[in-house]
Amino acid sequence: MAVTACQGLGFVVSLIGIAGIIAATCMDQWSTQDLYNNPVTAVFNYQGLWRSCVRESSGFTECRGYFTLLGLPAMLQAVRALMIVGIVLGAIGLLVSIFALKCIRIGSMEDSAKANMTLTSGIMFIVSGLCAIAGVSVFANMLVTNFWMSTANMYTGMGGMVQTVQTRYTFGAALFVGWVAGGLTLIGGVMMCIACRGLAPEETNYKAVSYHASGHSVAYKPGGFKASTGFGSNTKNKKIYDGGARTEDEVQSYPSKHDYV
């Protein structure tokens, strides 16, 4: 029961996390204009991984995709790649984990197969979460670097007349969504891995078999009994083949050429 709950909760947490990673990747507010030094034009610029948006003083918002923009930073491409890898791995992980769920019966799937699938999906969720966290963190680092560079070169102009007031960018909502979503996916993955341990079939139990001598000779044949798991049909230590090994009720008093005294 606890295993099913852990697995189910891990799946739900990962599902929410991956939905968050997708949302963060699609969001436009990865970097937002720092309004500390609000320019006279009263515009608000925010940028995402795929497009840049500007809300003008009239309230009109215009967004443009970066496909027209040459020379995008390699770091931005790296962040895009990390987020996409995270989404793909997470999506595959979700697909695998659906079939691995203990509460869902698919044909005659063994518990060992479900355990393996749970572990696989768990590892995928962990890697997916790490990709998202890494992607968001790389972007955040890029923002911090850009912020201090912009602060140093904020005002540029000629002949005492300020000609440009450079925009400083700060953390956008997508960064926080990404961090939280990545964390949730990671936690979900860990929960799936924990659930996997409980799903795996128990190791072979060797049941003790007692031998009592009813006469002067003990009937014993090495290898006469199969090791029992406790789940099979040989739980009552019945005779497996004729050859000297007997259960307590079947021991005969006359010696055999195979007997060891």
Partner: nanobody, 120 residues
Framework: AVQLVDSGGGLVQAGGSLRLSCAPS????????MGWYRQAPGKQRELVAS???????TYADSVKGRFIISRDIAKNTVYLQMQSLKPEDTAVYYC??????????????WGQGTQVTVSS
């Protein structure tokens, strides 16, 4: 580096007209909130007129009905058609716009200014 280049100023008689134009030099990604400001000697800089990409225009009360701001989106150029000019319109006229030049690169850009003198 991107710059806003404004032109069209000069000396004109009262009641006359002038047309100012402003465009960015260099490669830009997008341009927003283009407008004109003016600064008379010993006075604060004030907004004359501005236009946004959706066509919304704003005018200072003192120029309403006399000045018309227009924009050529294809050329990223803004114009200020000034008619019925008065001596109090004498000032240095500055073009202003918010320009996005690239990824995490934008700013509030100003032109170098063009002198408009209205003689009575």
């Amino acid at each position: 580096a991107v710059q806003l280049v404004d032109s069209g100023g000069g000396l004109v008689q009262a009641g006359g007209s002038l047309r100012l134009s402003c465009a960015p030099s260099g490669k830009i990604f997008s341009i927003h909130n283009m407008g004109w400001y003016r600064q008379a000697p010993g006075k604060q800089r004030e907004l004359v007129a501005s236009t946004t990409n959706d066509g919304t225009t704003t005018y200072a009360d003192s120029v309403k009905g006399r000045f018309i701001i227009s924009r050529d989106i294809a050329k990223n150029t803004v114009y200020l058609q000034m008619q019925s000019l008065k001596p109090e319109d004498t000032a240095v006229y500055y073009c202003n716009a918010f320009i996005v030049t690239g990824f995490m690169a934008s700013g509030d850009y100003w032109g170098q200014g063009t002198q408009v003198t209205v003689s009575s």
